[in-house]
C-alpha cells in the first residue's frame, strides 16, 4: 500500500511540476523592468522567452514576438532548449508513469515491468526537473550580469542636461514558477525511483517439497525465504516511503526588440 502511495504521490507531484514548467516556459514575465531607479514610469516593460511586452498606464498591453532566431542571444536560445527538453522529457515521463502506476492494471503486466517503467519515469522526471532548474538559473544569471552592466552604464552618453536612462530588468514571476516547478518535478522523480525499489520483487519461490508420511498424503509447503534478487515474481514485502511537497500554483501573465545589453 505504501509503495502505491509513494508512486501515486510521486506522479502527482511530478504532474504539478511539469505543468509548472510548461506554464513558466509560456509566461511573458521572465524578466520585468526594475522600478527601483525609476518608480514613476508610466510604461512597464517585461520579457519572456518568446516575446516582450509593454504595459501602459491605461492598462493597454502590447506584446511583440521575437521573429528571429539568429538575432537572439545564444544564452536565450540555450534557455529555450533546456526548457523544451525539460517539457518533452517530463511529458514522456508522465506517459510512462501512467502505465507504471500500481493502481492501474493493464493486461497481465508484471510488477517487474512496472518497476522498470517507474524507474525510467523517475529518471526522466529528475532530468526534466534539472533541465528546468538549469534553464531558469542560466536566465537568472544572465539577468544579474546585465543588471550590473546596465547599472554601470546607467547614464553614459549624457549630453548636457539630456539623460538616456537605460531600462534595467530584474527577476520576473516566471523564474520563481520555474524554480518551484523544477524542484517539484525533481522531488516527484526521486519519489518514483524510491517507489521502484518497493515494486521490485524481492521473493525467491523455492519449489515445494512433498513429504509422504506413511498412511497419510500430506504436502508441506515451506514459505519462500526472502532474498534480494532484484526482479522476480510477485513480492509481498513493501517498504513505506513518504514524501511531501508544497506547491506554489500561482501563475500570472499580463498584460520589440529583446533588450539584454
Amino acid at each position: 500500500m505504501a509503495v502505491t502511495a509513494c508512486q501515486g504521490l510521486g506522479f502527482v507531484v511530478s504532474l504539478i511540476g511539469i505543468a509548472g514548467i510548461i506554464a513558466a516556459t509560456c509566461m511573458d514575465q521572465w524578466s520585468t523592468q526594475d522600478l527601483y531607479n525609476n518608480p514613476v514610469t508610466a510604461v512597464f516593460n517585461y520579457q519572456g522567452l518568446w516575446r516582450s511586452c509593454v504595459r501602459e498606464s491605461s492598462g493597454f498591453t502590447e506584446c511583440r514576438g521575437y521573429f528571429t532566431l539568429l538575432g537572439l542571444p545564444a544564452m536565450l536560445q540555450a534557455v529555450r532548449a533546456l526548457m523544451i527538453v525539460g517539457i518533452v522529457l517530463g511529458a514522456i515521463g508522465l506517459l510512462v508513469s501512467i502505465f507504471a502506476l500500481k493502481c492501474i492494471r493493464i493486461g497481465s503486466m508484471e510488477d517487474s515491468a512496472k518497476a522498470n517503467m517507474t524507474l525510467t519515469s523517475g529518471i526522466m522526471f529528475i532530468v526534466s526537473g534539472l533541465c528546468a532548474i538549469a534553464g531558469v538559473s542560466v536566465f537568472a544569471n544572465m539577468l544579474v550580469t546585465n543588471f550590473w552592466m546596465s547599472t554601470a552604464n546607467m547614464y553614459t552618453g549624457m549630453g548636457g542636461m539630456v539623460q538616456t536612462v537605460q531600462t534595467r530588468y530584474t527577476f520576473g514571476a516566471a523564474l520563481f514558477v520555474g524554480w518551484v516547478a523544477g524542484g517539484l518535478t525533481l522531488i516527484g522523480g526521486v519519489m518514483m525511483c524510491i517507489a521502484c525499489r518497493g515494486l521490485a520483487p524481492e521473493e525467491t519461490n523455492y519449489k515445494a517439497v512433498s513429504y509422504h508420511a506413511s498412511g497419510h498424503s500430506v504436502a508441506y509447503k515451506p514459505g519462500g525465504f526472502k532474498a534480494s534478487t532484484g526482479f522476480g515474481s510477485n513480492t509481498k514485502n513493501k517498504k513505506i516511503y513518504d514524501g511531501g511537497a508544497r506547491t506554489e500554483d500561482e501563475v500570472q501573465s499580463y498584460p520589440s526588440k529583446h533588450d539584454y545589453v
Partner: antibody
C-alpha cells in the same frame, strides 16, 4: 459619444477647500483612468494626478500631495477632485481628462473646465 | 521630473505656409521595450479645453487633419503644420507621457502673419 461634464465655477477664500466634479458618459466609466490637469490664467498646463475608477487607485503629483484627494462614484459615473488649504495661486481652470486606451498614455477627451477663483 | 521645453514661444506664419514647433525633453521619452516615443501634442483654442492632435510622437488622433504631422525621437520632437489654415490659430503644447508626473511644455502660440 464620449462626454465629460464638469461642475460650475467656484469662488473660495484662502484656506478653504473646493470639490470639483466630472460626470462621464458615452463609455464604460470603470474602464478608463481619469486625470486632472489645471491651467492658471494665461499660463500653461499642469498635471495634478489621476484616479482609476475601476479600483479607486490614485497617483498624485508630489507638488499637490497632502492637499489633493481624488475620489469616484461608480453609481453616477462621476469623479471628484478636492483641493484643500487653497491659496491665491490655486486660482485656475481645472480640467478632468480621460486617458485613452491606445493613445500611448495621452488624454483623448477633456471636460469643459471648471474655474476656481481663490480670493479673500 | 522631466522638463519639456518648447520653441519658439510664439510663431507667426502666413496662411498656406508651413509652421514648425519644436519640443525638447530633459530625458529620453523613447521606451526601449517597444521602441515607441511617449510624447503627445495638444491644440488649445481660446476658452476651450486642450484637444489631442498627436500621440506616440507621430500618430495622428482620429479626426485630426493630415496637415498635422509629428516627428522626432528620444528627446527632440517636432510638430509640423504643412499648410496653415485660419482655424489652426491656437496654443500648442507637447506633453511627456513616459514618466510621472506628466509634464507639459510651456506652450507655443501660433498666429497668422
Amino acid at each position: 459619444q464620449v462626454q465629460l461634464v464638469q461642475s460650475g465655477a467656484e469662488v473660495k477664500k484662502p484656506g478653504a477647500s473646493v470639490k470639483v466634479s466630472c460626470k462621464a458618459s458615452g463609455y464604460t466609466f470603470t474602464s478608463y483612468i481619469m486625470h486632472w490637469v489645471r491651467q492658471a490664467p494665461g499660463q500653461g498646463l499642469e498635471w495634478m494626478g489621476y484616479i482609476n475608477p475601476y479600483n479607486d487607485g490614485t497617483k498624485y503629483n508630489e507638488k499637490f500631495k497632502g492637499r489633493v484627494t481624488m475620489t469616484r462614484d461608480t453609481s453616477t459615473s462621476t469623479v471628484y477632485m478636492e483641493l484643500s488649504s487653497l491659496r491665491s495661486e490655486d486660482t485656475a481652470v481645472y480640467y478632468c481628462a480621460r486617458l485613452g486606451f491606445t493613445t500611448r498614455n495621452a488624454m483623448d477627451y477633456w471636460g469643459q473646465g471648471t474655474l476656481v477663483t481663490v480670493s479673500s | 521630473d522631466i522638463v519639456m521645453t518648447q520653441s519658439p514661444d510664439s510663431l507667426a506664419v502666413s496662411l498656406g505656409e508651413r509652421a514648425t514647433i519644436n519640443c525638447k525633453s530633459s530625458q529620453s521619452l523613447l521606451n526601449s521595450g517597444n521602441q515607441k516615443n511617449y510624447l503627445a501634442w495638444y491644440q488649445q483654442k481660446p476658452g476651450q479645453p486642450p484637444k489631442l492632435l498627436i500621440y506616440g510622437a507621430s500618430t495622428r488622433e482620429s479626426g485630426v487633419p493630415d496637415r498635422f504631422t509629428g516627428s522626432g525621437s528620444g528627446t527632440d520632437f517636432t510638430l509640423t503644420i504643412s499648410s496653415l489654415q485660419a482655424e489652426d490659430v491656437a496654443v500648442y503644447y507637447c506633453q511627456n507621457d513616459h514618466s510621472y508626473p506628466f509634464t507639459f511644455g510651456q506652450g507655443t502660440k501660433l498666429e497668422i502673419k
